[in-house]
Interface confidence: low
Amino acid sequence: ASVGLPGDSLHPPKLSTQKDILTILANTTLQITCRGQRDLDWLWPNTPRDSEERVLVTECGDSIFCKTLTVPRVVGNDTGAYKCFYRDTDVSSIVYVYVQDHRSPFIASVSDEHGIVYITENKNKTVVIPCRGSISNLNVSLCARYPEKRFVPDGNRISWDSEKGFTIPSYMISYAGMVFCEAKINDETYQSIMYIVLVVGYRIYDVVLSPPHEIELSAGEKLVLNCTARTELNVGLDFSWQFPSSKHQHKKIVNRDVKSLPGTVAKMFLSTLTIDSVTKSDQGEYTCTAYSGLMTKKNKTFVRVHTKPFIAFGSGMKSLVEATVGSQVRIPVKYLSYPAPDIKWYRNGRPIESNYTMIVGDELTIMEVSERDAGNYTVILTNPISMEKQSHMVSLVVNVPPQIGEKALISPMDSYQYGTMQTLTCTVYANPPLHHIQWYWQLEEACSYRPSQTNPYTCKEWRHVKDFQGGNKIEVTKNQYALIEGKNKTVSTLVIQAAYVSALYKCEAINKAGRGERVISFHVIRGPEITVQPATQPTERESMSLLCTADRNTFENLTWYKLGSQATSVHMGESLTPVCKNLDALWKLNGTVFSNSTNDILIVAFQNASLQDQGNYVCSAQDKKTKKRHCLVKQLVILERMAPMITGNLENQTTTIGETIEVVCPTSGNPTPLITWFKDNETLVEDSGIVLKDGNRNLTIRRVRKEDGGLYTCQACNVLGCARAETLFIIEGVQEKTNLE
């Protein structure tokens, strides 16, 4: 067989035998002559090997380009391909020689010394056991052990070829530890050498590049890319890299196996690509490919090389952020930078540190924003290499949905006397200011009452106050604006001209941040009246009484109840006035009945009122004729005892003789403190020139004289103690002599 490159003017050398296959007997001499057009060489089976001196290659003598190959006393192992070729070319002629040796029909090649067959468990893969034969038409079977199994050629996927060996699907022998070929000649059995079976994996689970995604560097920096492949066990792996720059001299690739963690069924391989000093030409896509012989997996990353470090804010940075109070605010920092900048946040010029309410970093997060958090926030980015700084200011506006002041109080449940004029108010704080405050109303019987709920009243429909058909005549006064507790608040007032109908009134306030509402129960009754004695606001530990007065001719069975937590057992869905229908659920109080000519008065006395006595008290009276119960509710608020305090400063005063001095002693305390004034530690007594007003809070000295100068002390005392404040009066000028003659 001649082998040559097409179009080549060189003709393949000619062999003395015309056959492609030559069969000779063992112990005979093999001689083949080769003639050609230029220098020739021979290659024979199992070269190079120790017995090389057995093979003779000699010049022919009759021609320059002629060589004869002689092998005396051939043996079975000399079976194989004999090739004559032109030096330094691929042009050749080959003859396959079978040396028929019935004593050793299998050829042992040099590589067979290892006797290892590598297989994969892939169903589609076949493996060749290289038990080649010195006889072309042998009946060969394959023996595998342990357990012992024999495989014979089936004319399909199992076959034997004297030039190649025994071919079999690899999965069939993957269980075996060793295999060998066996041939039968004239009832004699011949075996090839033993081949150890090694199952080789091929699966690559994944290929991971680190760092992943995009890598940013500036020129001159070192690039290190790690490519880690995870494979099944018994895998051999090759890595290859693709990269943008064709200059390879500054790139270094190191491949190594990584020790697998104990107990894992995966093997790790690592290939590291290093460029000590990157240039712009190194920018681009880097691909790492892992190949296991049967499987390829790759991963890629992009390397961006900047000519120098830089820093700038991204276009998406906001200058104004609006948030609703209580919400979470996130102000992200959008920047373009290499390397990543140091980020520092400042609020109104002061640095912010992370705490449980604020988290600073790539974005500023305020967990639950409050109005206090409003202000100017500045973020300063610093490039850690160039130290270049960039700053950006964000104004945070915190919007507050309308908050209705009265809502914070216990919902007033007072009943209103028939025919009286009443005023309902809603005090609203909102930021930004309100779009509007609207009032709505609905008849009491059109709504349902569920006391256990935060919002106990449910009205299917609310009517605008302009539509007062069937209700009380209403007027909404112009909104007032007041500075309360340091906040600008809106006070909306609803005036009920005459209370004839029991209704619910709702004020609804809306601004851009949201809405707030307050529902006011307006229960109108003709009948009993509740009064508190004394009329002043009671303070704890004081004595006070609740009086329920009812016309003796109309009402009977006056009873006091306290609307305590037991009231939650009021049946669901009852209309308003449920208190009367569920008196059993209330806490009955012992009262004392007094009578005068027209009324019965039921008194509940509190000898030593405590904060626990606060709450809603119900007076129940039964109509003598109809037997219908009427209930009246009074909200009792008891002030906590407080020691006296002087709540402001008493300024020293300088005045001229004959002028008027006025000074106020600002006090607080419960019970209301008793105020006494002293001059130079002597109790001050009212006379024609000294006037004390407003419970001695105001001291006025008219037509001051020189002797009115001195140290004045204001003392406020109640049962819990006293508080004092001093002021100095300096009187200037000369006292005129008075002529009394």
Epitope: T324, N455, E461, I510, R515, E517
Partner: antibody, heavy 115, light 108 residues
Amino acid sequence: EVQLLESGGGLVQPGGSLRLSCAASGFTFSWYVMGWVRQAPGKGLEWVSSIYPQGGATSYADSVKGRFTISRDNSKNTLYLQMNSLRAEDTAVYYCARGNYFDYWGQGTLVTVSS
Amino acid sequence: DIQMTQSPGTLSLSPGEGATLSCRASQSVSSNYFGWYQQKPGQAPRLLIYGASSRATGIPDRFSGSGSGTDFTLTISRLEPEDSAVYYCQQFDSLPLTFGGGTKVEIK
């Protein structure tokens, strides 16, 4: 980002019923008045109904009073419109809108009443 | 019920020109409870102006509102091609809430 997504529209015979839903996200649903506004093919906008956030107070246009019921589930951030005794003149795109000022609207759902 | 009447029905103008849209209420409406909306074909309406004169979030300053009592005006100072739409006015001073019939603005 405030989003309102209506669903439940479709073809229904006169006298039939439908329930529209509006799923809200991106804002505190329980703070806002919510409403339904409809638009008949080629016509202008018509307010249908509004509901208040907590108390569940409602108001309706005369044309739907007694037939339509607005409701809301603040825990699910969802607004509903139950439409009964539907008439041919109720055919329209129904929009869900936020607030007393309808500052955000859904994309609408088409209700066709036809035999 | 408060009727809202818009005029003109259609307005055809060139880009860069100014547009004035009118809305009249059948009875006095508090300016606090008056708004303007824009609706483009196949889209939901969008709030432009609330409280008669306050611009809604994200609305360009070429849109402005004015008026009180029964007469309200929407002004578009410099028309852009994207302003081609139907504009509706609305009151919610009293129930039922009512919209105007709309003014169609066409850009030549």
